[in-house]
Amino acid sequence: RWRGEGTSAHLRDIFLGRCAEYRALLSPEQRNKNCTAIWEAFKVALDKDPCSVLPSDYDLFINLSRHSIPRDKSLFWENSHLLVNSFADNTRRFMPLSDVLYGRVADFLSWCRQKNDSGLDYQSCPTSEDCENNPVDSFWKRASIQYSKDSSGVIHVMLNGSEPTGAYPIKGFFADYEIPNLQKEKITRIEIWVMHEIGGPNVESCGEGSMKVLEKRLKDMGFQYSCINDYRPVKLLQCVDHSTHPDCALKSAAAATQRKA
């Protein structure tokens, strides 16, 4: 058995359903996406040995599903997937990779062919611990590269300052596939948000530890860089689920309540 979870049940139905649903979010001139053709292009990877799928195997899929990303709306992330999805709010606030068509259809899904057979493996799929060229990692590498290339204006990045190995994973999708593919001439600046989990450990903040590595890397590449600790709009969203925690005390709101009383 592989280390990863097996192919998601009803993969095709979920994929096609998400694709059809997403088309409604696209501008009229971009709405002519053929979801069946996109699925067929995606399915090419499902016909290959589960340890022999390359990022380039998804080229046709990307070309068919690609669309523009609004300027200033790109949101990159590491170790904050759910928070990013919630905050982006189905493209309303931002458009992270999971909110572009080619990311949406695969978000939180798993897929692979059986090792010695043509059917899908619903029991387990390889992770990077099993082999580098597995279907899911190769997909996200290719998708990440495209997302970076198509991003413009102010680039936003949400990182997790409570992550034990550091807010900026030196070995991660953002470091290895996204930063190298940012198009300098299209980007005005990069804004980092270092978020800390409510009640979680304070591992790093702006200008500390691995964040110094990230800052140096981006500045060396010629990008304008800024960093915000616990960006307030995101913090408020985190506090929805932790309203009584001391980190979520709204001093101005408390004062207003007292005045009323």
Epitope: R3, S128, E129, D130, C131, E132, G161, S162, P164, T165, G166, Y168, I170, K171, H196, P201, N202, V203, E204, S205, G207, E208, G209, S210, K212, V213
Partner: antibody, heavy 117, light 109 residues
Framework: QVQLKESGPGLVQPSQTLSLTCTVS????????VSWVRQPPGKGLEWMGI???????AYNSLLKSRLSISRDTSKSQVFLKMNSLQTEDTATYYC???????????WGQGVMVTVSS | QFVLTQPNSVSTNLGSTVKLSCKRS????????VNWYQQHEGRSPTTMIY?????PDGVPDRFSGSIDRSSNSALLTISNVQTEDEADYFC????????FGGGTKLTVL
């Protein structure tokens, strides 16, 4: 230049508590993480725990129950406290600096601690 | 938590090339970098290689790091071995915490 220097008692009685200090210079404890690593005589290195730039800590699960790491940023000092010492805790204790929590770029000279009655 | 296994000792001739291995027990090094430290007798460790293959300033270019995926091992290669290279070498990686290999004693003949 970057320096880390460990200090503390060379001899500790069994069942007693070990207190060590790591005094750093050439960098800020709010910019770099500091770990404690120990090495029994003639043996390999064992990571004990870390104090992150944010002030939170993490510990080796085998030592967690009797280990505590803290710091005083104004004095540029990191402290290690370990209770219930046994003879197998005899080792050279190092503090080490990290810019990311996953590797060390500078090490202290080490302090030899013997646990014996 | 995985284990990093290194040979206890390796002997090599002056001026030759030697490869020190560090084998990971489970999984691979795909998600985690490997770092190498040199420790001379009675001294504290110093970083020789970090993030798989990067050399800190001051470390001779005779030292290089790599990952051999076929054997799931990290390799520290020392070319043109000198007498001052005689030391203990420790590999290190991480998952939920820092993990060290047991170390290899390099003897230069």
């Amino acid at each position: 230049q970057v320096q880390l220097k460990e200090s503390g008692p060379g001899l500790v009685q069994p069942s007693q508590t070990l207190s060590l200090t790591c005094t750093v210079s050439g960098f800020s404890l709010t910019s770099y993480h500091v770990s404690w690593v120990r090495q029994p005589p003639g043996k390999g290195l064992e990571w004990m725990g870390i104090i992150w730039t944010g002030g939170s800590t993490a510990y080796n699960s085998l030592l967690k129950s009797r280990l505590s790491i803290s710091r005083d940023t104004s004095k540029s000092q990191v402290f290690l406290k370990m209770n219930s010492l046994q003879t197998e805790d005899t080792a050279t204790y190092y503090c080490a600096r990290s810019i990311t929590p996953t590797f060390f770029d500078y090490w202290g000279q080490g302090v030899m601690v013997t646990v014996s009655s | 938590q995985f284990v990093l296994t290194q040979p206890n000792s390796v002997s090599t001739n002056l001026g030759s090339t030697v490869k020190l291995s560090c084998k990971r027990s489970t999984g691979n090094f795909g998600n985690n970098y490997v770092n190498w430290y040199q420790q001379h007798e009675g001294r504290s460790p110093t970083t020789m290689i970090y993030r798989d293959d990067k050399r800190p300033d001051g470390v001779p270019d005779r030292f290089s790091g790599s990952i051999d995926r076929s054997s799931n091992s990290a390799l520290l290669t020392i070319s043109n071995v000198q007498t001052e290279d005689e030391a203990d070498y420790f590999c290190q990686s991480y998952s939920s915490g820092i993990v060290f290999g047991g170390g290899t004693k390099l003897t230069v003949l």
